[in-house]
C-alpha cells in the first residue's frame, strides 16, 4: 500500500550527469531502511510506456547508470524510482525532464604541461564521451560542441596572469623567467550552452637556463 507521504521512503530522485555519463541517484526517506529495494524505469518525452532498466530492479544501492539508455543528444528523458520497503510499503518518484546536452556538466580537461627554459607548453587531449556516432566510434566533447574552446591562464605572480584561448589543442606561454614556478589553469568553455568546466591545474617550473653556466 502507498505510504502517507512518498517522501517517507524516497527523496531527491535526479540525474547527475558529467561528460554525458548519466547517473540516476536518489536518497531514502526517513522511513527508508537498508532492506528497502528500488526499481528503476525510464522513458522518453511524450511516450506512455516506461521501460524497466535491467540491472536496476530490486536493488539496494541508491544509484543506477542510465548512460546507454539516455544516449540520444536531442531526446528528452525521464526516469522514475519505485521504492518498496520490507513491510511492503511503496512509493514512486520521477525526475524532472532531462536533456543531457543541457544538463551535463564538464569535467576538467586532460592536459599535459611541459616545462621549457623560457616557456611552458600545454597540450590539451580530446575528451572522450560515452556518446557514439552512427559508425560506432565514440564522440569527443569537441565533436559534440562545435563552439567549444579552451581558456588557459598562467599565474606569473600575485598580480599578473597571462591568458591564451582558442579551439586548437596546443598552446605555449612564452617570455617566462627560467627556473621559476608557475600555476597553470585550463578550462573548457561552451558558450551556446553556458557551460564551463572545472579547471585543470598544473604547477610547473621552467627549466634552469644552462647557457650561462
Amino acid at each position: 500500500h502507498a505510504p502517507e507521504d512518498p517522501s517517507d521512503l524516497l527523496q531527491h530522485v535526479k540525474f547527475q550527469s558529467s561528460n554525458f555519463e548519466n547517473i540516476l541517484t536518489w536518497d531514502s526517506g526517513p522511513e527508508g531502511t537498508p532492506d528497502t529495494v528500488y526499481s528503476i524505469e525510464y522513458k522518453t518525452y511524450g511516450e506512455r510506456d516506461w521501460v524497466a532498466k535491467k540491472g536496476c530492479q530490486r536493488i539496494t544501492r541508491k544509484s543506477c547508470n542510465l548512460t546507454v539508455e539516455t544516449g540520444n543528444l536531442t531526446e528528452l528523458y525521464y526516469a522514475r524510482v519505485t521504492a518498496v520497503s520490507a513491510g511492503g510499503r511503496s512509493a514512486t518518484k520521477m525526475t524532472d525532464r532531462f536533456s543531457s546536452l543541457q544538463h551535463t556538466t564538464l569535467k576538467p580537461p586532460d592536459v599535459t604541461c611541459i616545462s621549457k627554459v623560457r616557456s611552458i607548453q600545454m597540450i590539451v587531449h580530446p575528451t572522450p564521451t560515452p556518446i557514439r556516432a552512427g559508425d560506432g566510434h565514440r564522440l569527443t566533447l569537441e565533436d559534440i560542441f562545435h563552439d567549444l574552446f579552451y581558456h588557459l591562464e598562467l599565474q606569473v605572480n600575485r598580480t599578473y596572469q597571462m591568458h591564451l584561448g582558442g579551439k586548437q589543442r596546443e598552446y605555449e606561454f612564452f617570455g617566462l623567467t627560467p627556473d621559476t614556478e608557475f600555476l597553470g589553469t585550463i578550462m573548457i568553455c561552451v558558450p551556446t550552452w553556458a557551460k564551463e568546466s572545472a579547471p585543470y591545474m598544473c604547477r610547473v617550473k621552467t627549466l634552469p637556463d644552462r647557457t650561462w653556466t
Epitope: 511524450g46 536531442t74 531526446e75 512509493a91 518518484k93 520521477m94 525526475t95 524532472d96
Partner: antibody, heavy 116, light 113 residues
C-alpha cells in the same frame, strides 16, 4: 482506474484569490506530470502550466506567471492551482490534466466565477 | 508561441458521412529525436471534459474507435472521421506539445444534420 477529482464551483469577489484542488486516484500523483488548463468562451483552451509532483518543479505559460501558482501535497495525492488578484477575465472552467506532453486524463473541471 | 489554426470553425454533416477537419501550426511540429509530430487531438462533448483521441499526430488512443484517424506532418494536420455517428457531436481541438507554452487550436464544432 485513473481518476482526477476536482473541487467544486467557486463564486469569488474581484481582487481575491481562489485555490482549486485536483485529487488523483488510481495512480500515484508523483509518478507523472500534472498540467492545468483554462477554458473560457473567449480564449478556448489555454495551457496554464505544469508541475512535476515529485520535485515541485514548475513550468508556466508566461501569460499566467503572475496569476497562477501550482503546488502539490504528496501525502494526500492532490495537486492545487491558486489564482490571485481575480478579475472577470479569470471567470472560466479550470481543468487539471495528467501527463508530460499531451493529456491522457482530465479532471471534470472547476468553474470559477468572479463577480461582485 | 506556436499558433494553432483550426478550420472550419464548425460543420454540419449527416450520420454516416465522412468528415475531415484541419489544424495548421505556425511552425513545424516535427520532433527530430523520433521523427514524429508533436500534435494531439481531443474531443469535447457538451458539458464534459476534453478526451484524448490522437497523439503523435496519428497514434490512436486506446479505446478510441478506428473511425477516427489523424494524419499530416510538419505544419498541416487533419482529423478524419470516416463515418460519423450521432455520438460524435462535439468540439474537436488540436494541441501542440513541441514547445512551451503548449497551445491549442480554437476548435472545430461538429454538428449533426
Amino acid at each position: 482506474e485513473v481518476q482526477l477529482q476536482q473541487s467544486g464551483p467557486e463564486l469569488v469577489r474581484p481582487g481575491t484569490s481562489v485555490k482549486i484542488s485536483c485529487k488523483a486516484s488510481g495512480y500515484s500523483l508523483t509518478a507523472d506530470y500534472m498540467n492545468w488548463v483554462k477554458q473560457s468562451p473567449e480564449e478556448s483552451l489555454e495551457w496554464i502550466g505544469e508541475i512535476n509532483p515529485s520535485t515541485g518543479t514548475t513550468t508556466y505559460n508566461q501569460k499566467f506567471e503572475a496569476k497562477a501558482t501550482l503546488t502539490v501535497d504528496q501525502s494526500s495525492n492532490t495537486a492545487y492551482l491558486q489564482l490571485t488578484s481575480l478579475t472577470s477575465e479569470d471567470s472560466a472552467v479550470y481543468y487539471c490534466a495528467r501527463f508530460d506532453a499531451y493529456f491522457d486524463y482530465w479532471g471534470q473541471g472547476t468553474t470559477v466565477t468572479v463577480s461582485s | 508561441d506556436i499558433v494553432m489554426t483550426q478550420s472550419p470553425s464548425s460543420l454540419a454533416v449527416s450520420v454516416g458521412e465522412k468528415v475531415t477537419m484541419s489544424c495548421k501550426s505556425s511552425q513545424s511540429l516535427l520532433y527530430s529525436s523520433n521523427q514524429k509530430n508533436c500534435l494531439a487531438w481531443y474531443q469535447q462533448k457538451p458539458g464534459q471534459s476534453p478526451k484524448l483521441l490522437i497523439y503523435w499526430a496519428s497514434s490512436r488512443e486506446s479505446g478510441v474507435p478506428d473511425r477516427f484517424t489523424g494524419s499530416g506532418s510538419g505544419t498541416d494536420f487533419t482529423l478524419t472521421i470516416s463515418s460519423v455517428k450521432t455520438e460524435d457531436l462535439a468540439v474537436y481541438y488540436c494541441q501542440q506539445y513541441f514547445s512551451y507554452p503548449f497551445t491549442f487550436g480554437s476548435g472545430t464544432k461538429l454538428e449533426i444534420k
